[in-house]
């Protein structure tokens, strides 16, 4: 064997945004006839020698930093990416709005803003459909997500969420979800 | 109160061997990754092997593998070192040593550890 | 060669502050694995001393305190006594082969 082992994949089935109280299962997938199998949480540092994780219930101290890797003979892979899993619903959920307005003509520029009732400094927008997320550190109650032109492909479901940067891993419940229109 | 106790310790020519044990009381053995790490003489810690609360999990540092293999038997609250081919530079106090656990979860250090057992490689 | 580098001696008077550093890399304390610190006194068997950086365990005095940052950590021994007189190894973990590395450990001498 020259050179480590290629890494696995960890996921979070079925996401890994979970609200509190919800179950979710983290998965770790190497090559087949693995041997053995390390799922790791991370601050503190500590393993279990499976290839899942079940969390029947999500509680705040579940939420965190997760990798895995794998043993082959006494051949160790690459760690997986690192999952982030995110316990939501810790806190009250912040309001989502669209300005100048929800329904804009294409080729129009739109704000969405997101303001939480508490002095959070980070805030998440998801676009319902989409794999990727918009991430804005922003200080004290609000953030404004400014789309550029915009076209018909960003037409959709949108929601956000606000944490605090001391807190990563704890996020508010969503906002109401807020429809864009594109018109035109 | 934890306790472990190594034993099995001695003089022995180089290419001999030697089973080390460690016997374990005062905690649920079977629970724990246990580990063997050693000290030569005048010298620092040197991690030897590990072994998995199931006796699956196996690592060795790259010094002794090949030629020493950890096991344990928890029906017996036992650990044990098989060790072959021995060189001059094996020449070590060997201590047992447990691995914290919290839950489901295993730590990445040793809570408690024995007192040692001496081994000495030499003709 | 240990992994982890530790000054070999360091020393102090009574009721001085002294700190032991130890420098490892981006595959161990670099790769966001905890520093764990041990206390051996002369003639025993090391003593978990400091776990999870900063964290002591039960029976510890509050005179020993450990930090982390980077790829580096440390051990502050503050109101020196002569009973501190040991060797300290730092631990760590590396995930290139799992393996669990030490320090060279840092002798402790307490002057006077």
């Known amino acids: 064997q020259s050179g480590p082992l290629p890494k696995p994949s960890l996921q979070a089935q079925p996401s890994s945004l979970v609200p509190l109280g919800q179950s979710v299962i983290l998965r770790c997938q190497g090559p087949p006839d693995v041997d053995l199998y390390r799922l790791e949480k991370l601050k503190p540092e500590k393993y279990e020698d499976q290839d899942f994780l079940f969390i029947p219930t999500m509680e705040r101290s579940n939420a965190g930093r997760y990798r895995c890797s794998y043993q082959n003979g006494s051949h160790w892979s690459l760690p997986s990416d690192q999952l982030e899993l995110i316990a939501t619903g810790v806190y009250a959920k912040p309001s989502l709005s669209a300005h100048p307005s929800s329904a804009v003509p294409q080729g129009r520029d739109v704000t969405l803003k997101c303001q939480s009732p508490y002095s959070f400094d980070e805030f998440v927008l998801y676009k319902e459909g989409d794999t990727g997320s918009y991430k804005r550190p922003e200080k004290w109650y609000r953030a404004n997500f400014p789309i550029i032109t915009v076209t018909a492909a960003h037409s959709g479901t949108y929601r956000c969420y606000s944490f605090s940067s001391s807190s990563p891993y704890l996020w508010s419940a969503p906002s109401d979800p807020l429809v864009l229109v594109v018109t035109g | 109160q934890v306790q472990l106790v190594e034993s099995g310790g001695g003089l022995v020519k180089p290419g001999g061997s030697l089973r080390l044990s460690c016997a374990a009381s005062?905690?649920?053995?079977?629970?724990?990754?246990m580990s063997w790490i050693r000290q030569a003489p005048g010298k620092g810690l040197e991690w030897v092997s590990s072994v998995g609360s199931e006796g699956k999990f196996i690592d060795y540092a790259a010094s002794v593998k090949g030629r020493f293999t950890i096991s344990r038997d928890n029906a017996k609250n036992s650990l044990y070192l098989q060790m072959n081919s021995l060189r001059a530079e094996d020449t070590a106090v060997y201590y047992c040593?447990?691995?914290?656990?919290?839950?489901?979860?295993?730590?990445?250090?040793?809570?408690?550890w024995g007192q040692g057992t001496l081994v000495t490689v030499s003709s | 060669q240990s992994v982890l580098t530790q000054p070999p001696s360091v020393s102090g008077a009574p009721g001085q502050r002294v700190t032991i550093s130890c420098t490892g890399s981006?595959?161990?304390?670099?790769?966001?694995?905890?520093v764990h610190w041990y206390q051996q006194l002369p003639g025993t068997a090391p003593k978990l001393l400091i776990y999870g950086n900063s964290n002591r365990p039960s029976g510890v005095p509050d005179r020993f305190s450990g930090s982390k940052s980077g790829t580096s950590a440390s051990l502050a021994i503050t109101g020196l006594q002569a009973e501190d007189e040991a060797d300290y190894y730092c631990?760590?973990?590396?995930?290139?082969?799992?393996?669990?590395?030490f320090g060279g450990g840092t002798k402790l001498t307490v002057l006077g």
């Open positions: 981006s595959s161990n304390i670099g790769a966001g694995y905890d």
């Open positions: 040593a447990r691995h914290y656990r919290e839950f489901r979860w295993h730590y990445y250090y040793f809570d408690y």
């Open positions: 005062g905690f649920s053995f079977s629970d724990h990754y």
């Open positions: 631990q760590s973990h590396d995930l290139g082969a799992h393996v669990w590395v």
